[in-house]
Interface confidence: low
């Protein structure tokens, strides 16, 4: 698809005459008819196979034609075609005189023709105009012409369709030959493939538009070169997707178990010493005057219940003071002014006189205590649970709820670190509050008895009677050098009379 363009430039008819030689009255009001057709060796009448076009009246007798004539005419004249341009053509240009306003062929007398030119030849598609001038005895016509392709058609014959686009289906403009030229950021045959962000990982990244880098599952980062750790990985990293390699001090599948609670959380208060004792487990060793799991409680001197016989304790800056009930006196209300005759024992307690009746003692039934059996036994008062265990009263009995890492009736036992037999070469394992210790047999040393050492055979003092012991390093054995008066491998026999032999 293309357009044959004809630009009329100048028409000369100095005498103002028709082709017949008759003059126009008052002058030749000139318009043109153009016929474009297939190539003919001899241009002959017949259908204008490539198209026709007419102009309005452009001037009288001699005139120059403006680039775009007013009055509805167009210059250059357009003759569009909807086929492959063959490269050859025939062109007929007729100049006519219009006596009136009706320019239709049937409305004009046959002798209204002023001149007629016919040319034929080759014409390639291109932007350049071909200038031509045709002269007859009475007239001269100067014009130029060319063939150009319609919008979106390209190539030597205007046969190549290419429509620039910028959407899902392509991102390109068209080159003069009709080939696609991708817009920046796009590639591929139809420029549908975006060029990803520079450096975007070839395997782990992709893109749906230019300069983008979208990550495939398991990868992240601007260039999709960082792996994504296991979902839920709290304190860990990865070297390949979905891994969770724990940072120092953390453990568990999601690296969310704190193996160094003391450092990460500093749970112990009031200057206490913190010891890790397993995952999320710790022990606080309190400074004097403090108590509680985290040493968060200040000890009161009255907490130890120093006042006897129902005396009430009052804290003072420099200690405490006991307020004694009637019948008692002393620093701790330990002295009584009562005797068994006063029935001082409560809750079924039996009274026993002491010091010839000047004093007494109560023997309390189960579940009661105190000098006068006045107190119900609280089995947790004495804080029987060790290692921060929680004491729970259970009717007549009690139980300890142990913190992680401890066990036993009173939480007195560490959950044994020795259970997995960590000591090598027959070493003896000892559970400590913060870990374990190996006692190694002779010939071994190191934290786990893993280091072999030479045996000092004299270490066990095998020589008697102040003999000197020497170690033979080559055989790991000892030699005793006996003092005067002793013999034997260990200098164990005193020298006496010669032994009496039985022969």
């Amino acid at each position: 698809s293309g357009v044959f363009q004809l630009q009329l430039q100048e028409f000369i008819n100095e005498r103002g005459v028709l082709a017949s030689g008759r003059p126009c009255e008052p002058g030749c009001r000139t318009f043109f008819r153009v016929c474009l057709k297939h190539f003919q060796a001899v241009v002959s009448p017949g259908p204008c196979t490539f198209g026709t076009v007419s102009t309005p009246v452009l001037g009288t007798n001699s005139f120059a034609v403006r680039d775009d004539s007013s009055g509805g005419g167009r210059n250059p004249l357009q003759l569009p075609f909807n086929f492959t341009w063959p490269g050859t053509f025939s062109l007929i240009i007729e100049a006519w005189h219009a006596p009136g306003d009706d320019l239709r062929p049937e409305a004009l007398p046959p002798d209204a023709l002023i001149s007629k030119i016919a040319i034929q030849g080759s014409l390639a598609v291109g932007q350049n105009w071909l200038l031509d001038e045709q002269t007859s005895t009475l007239t001269r016509l100067r014009y130029s012409y060319r063939v150009i392709c319609s919008d979106n058609y390209y190539g030597d014959n205007c046969s190549r369709l290419c429509k620039k686009r910028n959407d899902h289906f392509g991102h390109y403009v068209c080159q003069p030959d009709g080939n696609l030229s991708c817009l920046p950021g796009w590639t591929g045959e139809y420029c549908q493939q975006p060029i990803c962000l520079s450096g975007c990982h070839e395997q782990n990244g992709y893109c749906s538009k230019p300069a983008e880098c979208l990550c495939r599952p398991g990868w992240q980062g601007r260039l999709c070169n960082e792996c994504i750790p296991h979902n839920g990985c709290r304190h860990g990293t990865c070297s390949t997707p979905w891994q969770c390699t724990c940072d120092e001090g953390w453990g568990g599948l999601f690296c969310d178990q704190d193996l160094n609670y003391c450092t990460h959380h500093s749970p112990c208060k009031n200057g206490a010493t913190c010891s890790n004792s397993g995952q999320r487990s710790y022990t606080c060793t309190c400074r004097p005057g403090y108590t509680g799991v985290d040493c968060e409680l200040e000890l009161s001197e009255c907490d130890s219940n120093p006042c006897r016989n129902g005396g009430s304790c009052k804290d003072q800056e420099d200690g405490y003071h006991c307020l004694c009930p009637p019948g008692y006196y002393g620093l701790h209300c330990e002295h009584s002014t009562l005797s068994c005759a006063d029935s001082p024992c409560f809750n079924g307690g039996s009274c026993r006189e002491r010091n010839q009746g000047a004093n007494y003692a109560c023997e309390c039934p189960p579940n009661f205590t105190g000098s006068n059996c006045e107190k119900k036994v609280d089995r947790c008062t004495s804080n029987p649970c060790a290692n921060g265990g929680q004491c729970l009263n259970r009717g007549p009995s009690r139980m300890c709820r142990c913190r992680p890492g401890f066990t036993g009736t009173y939480c007195e036992l560490h959950v044994s670190d020795c259970a997995r037999n960590p000591c090598a070469h027959g070493g003896t394992c000892h559970d400590l509050e913060n870990g374990l210790m190996c006692t190694c047999p002779a010939g071994f040393s190191g934290r786990r008895c893993e280091v072999r050492t030479s045996i000092d055979a004299c270490a066990s003092s095998p020589c008697f009677n102040r003999a000197t012991c020497y170690t033979d390093l080559s055989t790991d054995t000892f030699v005793c050098n006996c003092p005067y008066g002793f013999v034997g491998s260990r200098c164990e026999f005193p020298v006496g009379l010669p032994p009496s032999f039985p022969w």
Partner: antibody, heavy 125, light 110 residues
Amino acid sequence: EVQLVQSGAEVKKPGASVKVSCKASGYTFTSDEINWVRQATGQGLEWLGWMNPHSGNTGYAQKFQGRVTMTRNTSISTADMELSSLTSDDTAVYYCARGHYYESSGYFFYGMDVWGQGTTVTVSS
Amino acid sequence: QPVLTQPASVSGSPGQSITISCTGTSSDVGGYNYVSWFQQHPGKAPKLMIYDVNNRPSGVSNRFSGSKSGNTASLTISGLQAEDGADYYCSSYTSSSTYVFGTGTKVTVL
């Protein structure tokens, strides 16, 4: 001027179907997507689906799958949205919106940049 | 059908800045840079204000800006003006090749 002009208001009975049309002008109809969005009185926007006028491909919201059909007629640059098995919950203003790809410094972006005036669909017995 | 969560209302005095949030999931807001913001005045069709997280169509004031962090996108209106009073909706592309809108935020200029 790029414009989307929608068909007029519709009143339908429960169980019936409604077809809303959207005529595009001022741009190449097949170059951009058409989205359909609805809004019940006093409520927010709810996306129904998209259609590619060039290929006819569609993408529907899961909620409307099996009940909505989006079609087009490229010769007259018109997109249609048909919703079947109507209930009173489908009473809303239905909008078509062009899904346009922008270009900026070699990058390409998507936005629902031009909207129709809206079509009121009332479902009542 | 999932929706993106927005605050029901936000207000500010003329000249102030306000920010509207839009929270989704890694399958929509967090997974793509395809977040748009729309302004809607009563009785009118929505108007595109921001596309692809932080891009403004021509004709939209540079007082409107967008951003995104993780699964949350934000629209900021600076130098608030009376005509900014309207409903605002966010929208995002999702991993199932669909779009989803936010619950909407009413902006009141005091």
